[in-house]
């Protein structure tokens, strides 16, 4: 009976605080008045005072909004004592899991990525890989799952779809034939990273692709 299932609390809660989360209850309260307390990081040790307990009702209280990216899980201990201070239960583990909200945008690891590829290569040739990170959870939710896309290509010669990007790995590849260094020596791609697996917040960066020379022209006299 002296057990509490893991408690899930969304981060960035708006209150009002204190917010009652769950009730600690010992069945020894049938015999004697019970006083409840909690200990551990987030209660009586840093970060202090995030959680409290109503000492006679046993209600576990949240005092402020939580931030999953700061602390994703709290491990507290619940205690129950009688009026004379004698412990009536073994300390009980209380796990508080902070559930994720999509409160961070993706961030590219660089503002500008640079890569190169030989002119005249076949479609499917890999050019470079770009990377964006998102502090949100990507295991239990899609909040931190990033999808990559190409927003624009400059110049648009010989046409505007010379490259593609793998939506999950960020690998940029050649998709069309016709790369010709003598005509276009460099492409600038505006790339996007969007969280929620493509349905959330978007951030942009630039990928510069240098077209390397191949010995494809005979000398002119």
């Amino acid at each position: 009976d002296w057990v509490v299932a893991p408690i899930s609390v969304p981060e960035n809660g708006k209150g009002p605080f204190p917010q009652r989360l769950n009730q600690l209850k010992s069945n020894k309260d049938r015999d004697t008045k019970i006083f409840y307390s909690i200990t551990g990081p987030g209660a009586d040790s840093p970060p202090e005072g995030v959680f409290a307990v109503e000492k006679e009702t046993g209600w576990l209280l949240l005092n402020k909004p939580l931030d999953r990216e700061e602390i994703a899980k709290y491990e507290l201990f619940g205690h129950a004592v009688s009026e004379n201070g004698a412990s009536v239960e073994d300390p009980m583990n209380i796990s508080i899991i902070v559930t994720d909200q999509n409160d961070h945008k993706p961030k590219f690891t660089q503002d500008t990525f640079r890569g190169s590829v030989l002119e005249g290569v076949l479609p499917g040739t890999s050019v470079m890989q770009v990377t964006a990170t998102d502090e949100d959870d990507a295991i239990y939710t899609y909040n931190g799952v990033v999808a990559y896309s190409i927003h624009s290509q400059e110049p648009k010669d010989p046409h505007d779809l010379m490259f593609t990007i793998h939506r999950s790995t960020g690998t940029i590849s050649v998709i069309s034939s016709g790369l010709d260094r003598e005509k276009v020596p460099e492409y600038t791609l505006t790339i996007q990273a969007t969280d929620m697996d493509g349905d959330g917040s978007t951030t942009t960066a630039v990928a510069v692709v240098e077209i390397l020379d191949a010995n494809d022209n005979a000398p002119m006299f």
Epitope: G15, P16, F17, P18, R20, Q23, K25, D44, P47, E48, G49, V50, A52, E54, K55, E56, T57, W59, L61, N63, K64
Partner: antibody, heavy 119, light 112 residues
Framework: QVQLQESGPGLVKPSETLSLTCTVS????????WSWIRQSPGKGLEWIGY???????NYNPSLKSRVTISVDTSKNQFSLKLSSVTAADTAVYYC?????????????WGQGTMVTVSS | DIVMTQSPLSLPVTPGEPASISCRSS???????????LDWYLQKPGQSPQLLIY???NRASGVPDRFSGSGSGTDFTLKISRVEAEDVGIYYC?????????FGQGTKVEIK
């Protein structure tokens, strides 16, 4: 025996900021909810807001835009600031401790300090 | 906000006789396992309020056992089994369920 003592000016001019301090003696400020409550003839007893010892605050929505409560654990004190006061803020201001049985249950009160808002 | 309504607003009493004050809330103050988040305070003349009863029926430390609290949900009662002269003052109920806590308008108890 925990005791609370309010201090601060008894007269504040309209549009200025009311500032009061509550000193906690005979016990620690840790582990409790410390509130400010005021009492005026017109509105009766009105809860203003609280601070938990680790600096988490919560204010009455009707006063939220004007209230700041802060704590100095090293001095065992907590303070109230109420900005842009008007005559309607004239009242006896009490500091109190909550959190013994339920988190409100104000079990210890200061003796109160009368604050008049007048030019 | 939860509105608290007390009655009567004035209560003349005779020492040694019982007295009763009613308090009604605009919504239920019960919150699991039978806990009612309703507190009673007494403000004696010239003093600050003092906690009498918390969680509906629990006497605060040092409060004489002639004071008792009862009720559940939205209707609550404070009873004084035998009024003493020192019991005069204004009695307030307060809901402690939700932020902001709110007080009743007070019941003035005075000796006849």
């Amino acid at each position: 025996q925990v005791q609370l003592q309010e201090s601060g000016p008894g007269l504040v001019k309209p549009s200025e900021t009311l500032s009061l301090t509550c000193t906690v003696s005979g016990g620690s400020i840790s582990g409790y909810y410390w509130s400010w409550i005021r009492q005026s003839p017109g509105k009766g007893l009105e809860w203003i807001g609280y601070i938990y010892y680790s600096a988490n605050t919560n204010y009455n929505p009707s006063l939220k835009s004007r209230v700041t409560i802060s704590v100095d654990t090293s001095k065992n004190q907590f303070s109230l600031k109420l900005s842009s006061v008007t005559a309607a803020d004239t009242a006896v201001y009490y500091c109190s401790r909550g959190g013994s049985g339920s988190y409100w249950a104000f079990d210890i009160w200061g003796q109160g300090t009368m604050v008049t808002v007048s030019s | 906000d939860i509105v608290m309504t007390q009655s009567p607003l004035s209560l003349p009493v005779t020492p040694g006789e019982p007295a009763s004050i009613s308090c009604r809330s605009s919504q239920s103050l019960m919150y699991s396992y039978g806990y009612n988040y309703l507190d009673w305070y007494l403000q004696k003349p010239g003093q600050s309020p003092q906690l009498l009863i918390y969680l509906g029926s629990n006497r605060a430390s040092g409060v004489p056992d002639r004071f008792s609290g009862s009720g559940s949900g939205t209707d609550f009662t404070l009873k004084i089994s035998r009024v003493e002269a020192e019991d005069v003052g204004i009695y307030y109920c307060m809901q402690a369920l939700q932020t902001p806590p709110t007080f009743g308008q007070g019941t003035k108890v005075e000796i006849k």
